[in-house]
């Protein structure tokens, strides 16, 4: 049976928690990604940003999970208007910011 949206979001939160807690060396060798506007379309925007990081096994599961939340196909180099113009941050900070936001969505009951 399909996974309930609450469970899918919980799984994504768990994965982001694991990434932040298990981080020893700089995440993805300190790669930088575009910062995003977290207020709308967060899953696709996050995927559009993270998909440009390659060769980083630590976030591959996150990329796959975000792909399940985003209704359209996302490919590297694709950017929506949700990107914060000309602002790049480290993947580790991106993951932390995303985690805080997704936890709030979960607590509010916004699973879709």
């Amino acid at each position: 049976s399909p996974v309930p949206p609450s469970t899918a979001l919980k799984e994504l939160i768990e994965e982001l928690v694991n990434i932040t807690q298990n981080q020893k060396a700089p995440l993805c060798n300190g790669s930088m990604v575009w910062s995003i506007n977290l207020t709308a379309g967060v899953y696709c925007a996050a995927l559009e940003s993270l998909i440009n990081v390659s060769g980083c096994s630590a976030i591959e599961k996150t990329q796959r999970m975000l792909n399940g939340f985003c209704p359209h196909k996302v490919s590297a180099g694709q950017f929506s208007s949700l990107r914060v113009r000309d602002t790049k941050i480290e993947v580790a900070q991106f993951v932390k910011d995303l985690l805080v936001h997704l936890k709030k969505l979960f607590r509010e009951g916004q699973f879709n």
Partner: antibody, heavy 123, light 107 residues
């Protein structure tokens, strides 16, 4: 020491509004990751979750009672207030407040409970 | 809403017996399962959280296990002070729901 203390009217008439207060000691609801729940237990029966409020004012309600429930917090007094409108004798129960702490993964586990306050709805 | 079904509703066992209480969720709750102990006339007390984790002060005879939809609370050696009603609760997401309770008595 973490303690929660419920206070309420004891006796309420049908159709009236029940107002319950939970005073928090040993922790603050202005602290990140803290939450407070209300749970009730009719005499001789099981536990029923009513509502929850997080430190940042995110609120959740039992859908079966949502239209009658309001949860709020007064951080300056370190209190959480629950209002239940249009009460009926079936709302007779011991009402408990309890603390929830979110840690890493979001846990909804109530680690400290108040002693409860018995509310009787009768004319 | 996630329904929680507890069994048995009551049991009677002798001091020193191993006691198991079961709890089943209507969907996978990913180990977000908590157990509470409620002694007569008292408020519930958190006994086990996240399936198997114990708050400080909970005796070692209490343990929890399970995954997916099926969970178990075990008392390895029942003591007179364990007379209580035990409730499971899913902590995955609101509305938070409890099992109907298991009343444990001493033979």
């Amino acid at each position: 020491e973490v303690t929660l203390r419920e206070s309420g009217p004891g006796l309420v008439k049908p159709t009236q509004t029940l107002t319950l207060t939970c005073t928090l000691y040993g922790f603050s609801l202005s602290t990140s990751d803290m939450g407070v729940d209300w749970i009730r237990q009719p005499p001789g029966k099981g536990l029923e979750w009513l509502a929850h409020i997080w430190w940042d004012d995110v609120k959740r309600y039992n859908p079966a009672l949502k239209s009658r429930l309001t949860i709020s917090k007064d951080t300056s007094k370190n209190q959480v207030v629950l209002k239940l409108t249009s009460v009926d004798p079936v709302d007779t129960a011991t009402y408990y407040c309890a603390r929830t702490v979110s840690s890493g993964y979001i846990y909804y586990a109530m680690d400290y409970w108040g002693q409860g306050t018995l509310v009787t709805v009768s004319s | 809403d996630i329904q929680m079904t507890q069994s048995p509703s009551s049991l009677s066992a002798s001091v020193g017996d191993r006691v198991t209480i079961s709890c089943r969720a209507s969907q996978d709750i990913r180990n977000y399962l908590n157990w509470y102990q409620q002694k007569p006339g008292k408020a519930p007390k958190l006994l086990i959280f996240y399936t198997s984790m114990k708050p400080r002060g909970v005796p070692s005879r209490f343990s929890g296990s399970g995954s997916g939809t099926d969970y178990t609370l075990t008392i390895s050696s029942l003591q007179p002070e364990d007379i209580a009603t035990y409730y499971c609760q899913q902590g995955l997401t609101p509305p938070l729901t409890f099992g109907g309770g298991t009343k444990v008595e001493i033979k």
